[in-house]
Interface confidence: medium
């Protein structure tokens, strides 16, 4: 069974068949005898009922309201009402774009990545048992494919397959011709599959400073667009006036991956800010990376092996 | 209305500068993240630069590393390019674009830009 209309508010394409199906259905099933009615107001007119009298392009079925087809004037708000349940819908009918074979503000994106799967599948379960005949067209040209009633493409997708895919239902209804335009804007893009963000250059530093003077830590790291690089240090950060983050900056690769870097600037060295760790983290969905920075007076030089120290 | 205004493009010989301001209006200005986009003819929209909401963290692409910087005020609602050394090959129509994450980074995907600026013309002779 066809799901139900609980968008409130719905844009369609003058001169195809629509519908609106409230959702109450089951129950409306439950009490035959309840009165059901549909309103429509636009405008100056407010609540006007409507039945199939009211317009020959009009039908009602149990928890439906058809149009065959819907046209300009249709835009409107709708009303369904039963007993105390009503539901309300606004309706916005645009006009079809004649130099085309659909109407670009009736497009649905799709991002796909290249060499993934991609499926397109032609499909209208509400109008099924109606449809002669389905069509997918690219970019407006008709495909060839085997299956003319639910036309599919199932493939990995290339940048060649980038286009505007349009499944087009051609049904009849009472002697008359109607098609219905659903269209795909795909888009193919690299692959974004993500990598593990690494920081740059060895875990842990000693860095010779002299009290007084300034230093600046610099962390580097090579990440995803996603992944956040911060320091932390000493009980709280934001304790130590003298301690300033500075901007971070990134570099976009040609892989469309960052290279980060955020500096720690410590100014007018004291005491406190020796021997203790400065940690940098780059985060991401994959688990954290973390390397630690020490400062050490220079004096004191001698009784560190000189490979764990950064100038 | 959202609106985004681009300004300050114009001809310059090589090795010149410029410095392209974007004026926000209609929006929450300091709630989206912000991003400078150029495109040369025939050739796809490009991300340049960007900023988050805050301004804590600026994004460049490789090619104008060192030479662009980017900045924002949020309480005049500005953005700035500032291009320095401009080559022939920094020749194209930049855009001005805000970014819908108010937490979290600028993006260098378009697609992920909700406003966008009318673009302002930089030309660079050699």
């Known amino acids: 069974a066809e799901s139900c209309t609980s968008r409130p508010h719905i844009t369609v394409v003058e001169g195809e068949p629509f519908y609106l199906k409230h959702c109450s259905c089951s129950l409306a099933h439950e009490i035959e005898t309840t009165t059901k009615s549909w309103y429509k107001s636009s405008g100056s007119q407010e609540h006007v009922e409507l039945n199939p009298r009211s317009s020959s392009r009009i039908a009602l079925h149990d928890c439906v309201l058809e149009f065959w087809p819907v046209e300009l004037n249709d835009t409107g708000s709708y009303f369904f009402q039963m007993k105390n349940y009503t539901q309300k819908w606004k309706l916005n009918v645009i006009r079809r774009n004649k130099h085309s074979c659909f109407t670009e503000r009736q497009v649905t994106s799709k991002i796909v990545e290249v060499k993934k799967f991609f499926q397109i599948t032609c499909e209208n379960s509400y109008y099924q048992t109606l449809v002669n005949s389905t069509s997918l067209y690219k970019n407006c040209k008709k495909l060839l494919l085997e299956n003319n009633k639910n036309p599919t493409i199932k493939k990995n997708a290339e940048f060649e397959d980038q286009g505007y895919y349009s499944c087009v239902h051609f049904l009849h209804h009472n002697g008359k011709l109607f098609n219905i335009t659903k269209t795909f804007n795909i888009t193919i893009v690299e692959d974004r599959s993500n990598i593990v963000p690494v920081l740059l250059g060895p875990k842990l530093n000693h860095v010779a400073v002299e009290l007084g003077k300034n230093v600046r830590l610099n962390c580097s790291a090579l990440l995803n667009e996603e992944d956040v690089i911060y320091w932390m240090f000493g009980e709280e950060n934001g304790s130590d006036p003298n301690i300033h983050e500075e901007k971070e900056m990134r570099i976009m690769t040609p892989e469309g991956k960052w290279h980060a870097s955020k500096v720690l600037r410590i100014e007018n060295i004291g005491e406190s800010n020796l021997n203790v760790l400065y940690n940098c983290t780059v985060a991401s969905t994959g688990g954290t990376d973390t390397k630690s920075f020490i400062l050490v007076r220079k004096a004191d030089m001698a009784d560190i092996p000189g490979h764990v120290f950064t100038r | 209305d959202v609106q985004l205004q681009e300004s300050g493009g114009g001809l310059v010989q090589a090795g010149g500068s410029l410095r392209l301001s974007c004026a926000a209006s209609g929006l929450p200005f300091s709630s989206y993240a912000m991003g400078w986009f150029r495109q040369a003819p025939g050739k796809d929209r490009e991300f340049v630069a960007g900023?988050?909401?805050?301004?804590?963290?600026?994004y460049y692409r490789d090619s104008v590393k060192g030479r662009f910087t980017i900045s924002r005020d949020n309480a005049k609602n500005t953005v700035w390019l500032q291009m320095n050394d401009l080559k022939p090959e920094d020749t194209a129509v930049y855009y001005c674009?805000?970014?819908?994450?108010?937490?979290?980074?600028?993006?260098?995907?378009?697609?992920?830009?909700?406003?966008w600026g009318q673009g302002t013309q930089v030309t660079v002779s050699s």
């Open positions: 674009a805000a970014a819908r994450r108010r937490v979290g980074l600028p993006l260098a995907d378009p697609r992920e830009y909700v406003y």
């Open positions: 900023i988050t909401w805050s301004g804590s963290s600026i």
